[in-house]
């Protein structure tokens, strides 16, 4: 079989602060050096990129400065964390990986984690 | 709109070069691989060329393999296909598609016709 | 390199009637890779069916896909005088990238 497995948790429950963090596996085929992490919010039928991030297997993940994602790498695993989220951002976040060298390129898409991000509460004025 | 154009197709004899070109817009190209796909005459669909994001990566079809170069430029939102030692069996079509952000070619260009006889 | 084979080749088909496409891969292909593509004479392919059985953004409801591993389906539940054209099968899981060679549904 040529096709690349993606395994993520199917479902994941934000913190207070708006964090959530998951883990993103692949099963590779081959032998990657350079592999893209890309994760994706899928609402309805549209998806829209949320961040994406290029690593040499061995070195860490790197994403832009101005990304809400961090993560870090080990072997065929990847740990992402997802930061700023509000109740609106609840959706099925989907991990993509690819595999793009050395040759073949390989494609792995999640079956999705849906995370759900409830807003924290006001506090309430205080009577002292 | 989102839509991506093609140009640069001609009639160029067996041995010469053409440039094609792929103007995106409506979208953030740099988020998207691009792959250039060609169908001959009356024939079905054969890519033939892939590059990634950031236009470090590039894969072709064996039947182009050595003659044909693609390349992007993101601050200008292109995408080329650079062909040389054209042979007849290079005539077709070709478009320029989006590799979609689940894997499939979710955008297409209207194609460049591209002829290669004497 | 996968090989992509679709069957028949030319299927004949009155409007208003069901039309069923195979397409049967050399290997396993996980169905997250699988797509379907429309292309009427002097067009370019249009995406109908990706992940083996996700419509595409505007697809109407009447062309649906299945399978998985080596073997997947498109149908065409009552085909409107629209949808005679060709249709391709492609695999994106790997490179390189490939098409089946195309099944031309005509009006009977």
């Known amino acids: 079989c040529k096709a690349m497995h993606v395994a993520q948790p199917a479902v994941v429950l934000a913190s207070s602060r708006g964090i959530a963090s998951f883990v993103c596996e692949y099963a590779s085929p081959g032998k990657a050096t350079e592999v893209r992490v890309t994760v994706l919010r899928q609402a309805d039928s549209q998806v829209t990129e949320v961040c994406a991030a290029t690593y040499m297997m061995g070195n860490e993940l790197t994403f832009l400065d101005d990304s809400i994602c961090t993560g870090t790498s080990s072997g065929n695993q990847v740990n992402l964390t997802i930061q700023g989220l509000r109740a609106m951002d609840t959706g099925l976040y989907i991990c993509k990986v690819e595999l793009m060298y050395p040759p073949p390129y390989y494609l792995g898409i999640g079956n999705g984690t849906q995370i759900y991000v409830i807003d924290p509460e006001p506090c309430p004025d205080s009577d002292f | 709109e989102v839509q991506l154009v093609e140009s640069g197709g001609g009639l160029v004899k067996p041995g010469g070069s053409l440039r094609l070109s792929c103007a995106a817009s409506?979208?953030?190209?740099?988020?998207?691989?691009m792959h250039w796909v060609r169908q001959a005459p009356g024939k079905g669909l054969e890519w033939v060329s892939f590059?990634?994001?950031?236009?470090?990566?590039?894969y072709y079809a064996d039947s182009v393999k050595g003659r044909f170069t693609i390349s992007r430029d993101n601050a200008k939102n292109s995408l080329y296909l650079q062909m040389n030692s054209l042979r007849a069996e290079d005539t077709a079509v070709y478009y320029c598609?989006?590799?979609?952000?689940?894997?499939?070619?979710?955008?297409w260009g209207q194609g460049t016709m591209v002829t290669v006889s004497s | 390199e996968i090989v992509l084979t679709q069957s028949p080749g030319t299927l004949s088909v009155s409007p208003g009637e069901r039309a069923t496409l195979s397409c049967r891969a050399s290997?396993?292909?996980?169905?997250?890779?699988l797509a379907w593509y429309q292309q009427k004479p002097g067009q370019a392919p249009r995406l109908l069916i990706y992940?083996?059985?996700s419509r595409a953004t505007g697809i109407p409801d009447r062309f649906s896909g299945s399978g998985s591993g080596t073997d997947f389906t498109l149908t065409i539940s009552r085909l409107e005088p629209e949808d005679f054209a060709v249709y391709y099968c492609?695999?994106?899981?790997?490179?390189?990238?490939?098409f089946g060679q195309g099944t031309k549904v005509e009006i009977k």
């Open positions: 598609a989006r590799g979609g952000h689940l894997g499939p070619f979710d955008l």
């Open positions: 409506g979208f953030t190209f740099s988020s998207y691989t």
């Open positions: 590059i990634s994001y950031d236009g470090n990566h590039k």
């Open positions: 290997q396993s292909v996980g169905s997250s890779y």
């Open positions: 992940g083996a059985f």
């Open positions: 492609q695999q994106y899981g790997s490179s390189p990238w490939t």
